[in-house]
Amino acid sequence: VPLSRTVRCTCISISNQPVNPRSLEKLEIIPASQFCPRVEIIATMKKKGEKRCLNPESKAIKNLLKAVSKERSKRSP
């Protein structure tokens, strides 16, 4: 069965490295579920659309999430 169609966690590696919010195209947060017991954060970078899994426990990534949500709240009326 192809991986992309199996209902399991999809992140093979995770990054603890800081990500510049300006270089982000998209940030997907997949909540924990019965199929995957952990939160998965998938960052799509503007350059070449490369996707990386981020470590939700990393301080740098928590700061990134704060920065992104702050930016979103600024934009929303």
Partner: antibody, heavy 121, light 108 residues
């Protein structure tokens, strides 16, 4: 320095078992998925198996499913490949390789020097 | 399953440019990664995402990818460039990494 060192290869009879190990150093092992890739003598590279950073997800090439088991011990920075019911076509140099960290586009940014497994009667 | 086709061998004189092709249907839609394997050694990643170079890889090595062919180009070839070169992609239909058969580069 950043490196991977495989061990455990050798000559084994068909149907027998062997366990390979790969010791990692110089990087945060527990953040990376790890792969086994093999190369039969004089042939090209073939991906064999991967295990996620936390050990929860494992995937295999069809030809080894049910016979090989990939595992890891993050406290020891070590990757393993348990190979059962070995066949002559499993004869190869086995490399452990670090996942690049890309999401659903696996490639390998660090390789060990490999360990030779010979299956012969 | 996605198939990658490489020429078995490429020969080039020192100082000249070597081009190693990797063919596959619409490979330009995929990301291609390249590995160099010198005799008796482990493979080394030399190009990722079609054209990016890991640190420590000389600028003489470059990559491109469009249509049905990806190409690894080695300019000003040196004797130390001899070895086998493998292209690799992620095959989304089988969800696994796939390697080309490899190309042996000989420096004349």
């Amino acid at each position: 320095q950043v490196q991977l060192v495989e061990s455990g290869g050798g000559v084994v009879q068909p149907g027998r078992s062997l366990r390979l190990s790969c010791a990692a150093s110089g990087f945060t092992f527990s953040s990376y998925g790890m792969h086994w890739v093999r190369q039969a003598p004089g042939k090209g590279l073939e991906w064999v198996a991967v295990i996620s950073y936390d050990g929860n997800n494992k995937y295999y090439v069809d030809s080894v499913k049910g016979r090989f088991t990939i595992s890891r011990d993050n406290s020891k920075n070590t990757l393993y490949l348990q190979m059962n019911s070995l066949r002559s076509e499993d004869t190869a140099v086995y490399y452990c390789a670090r996942d690049s960290g890309s999401y659903l586009d696996w490639y390998f940014d660090l390789w060990g020097r490999g360990t030779l497994v010979t299956v012969s009667s | 399953n996605f198939m990658l086709t490489q020429p078995p061998s490429v020969s080039v004189a020192p100082g000249k440019t070597a081009r190693i092709a990797c063919g596959g249907g619409n490979i330009g839609d995929k990301s291609v990664h390249w590995y160099q394997q010198k005799p008796g050694q482990a493979p080394v990643l030399v190009i990722f995402y079609d054209s990016d170079r890991p640190s420590g890889i000389p600028k003489r090595l470059s990559g491109s990818n469009s249509g049905n062919t990806a190409t690894l180009t080695i300019s000003r070839v040196e004797a130390g460039d001899e070895g086998d070169y493998y292209c690799q992609v992620w095959d989304s239909s089988s969800d696994r990494p796939v390697f080309g058969g490899g190309t042996k580069l000989t420096v004349l």
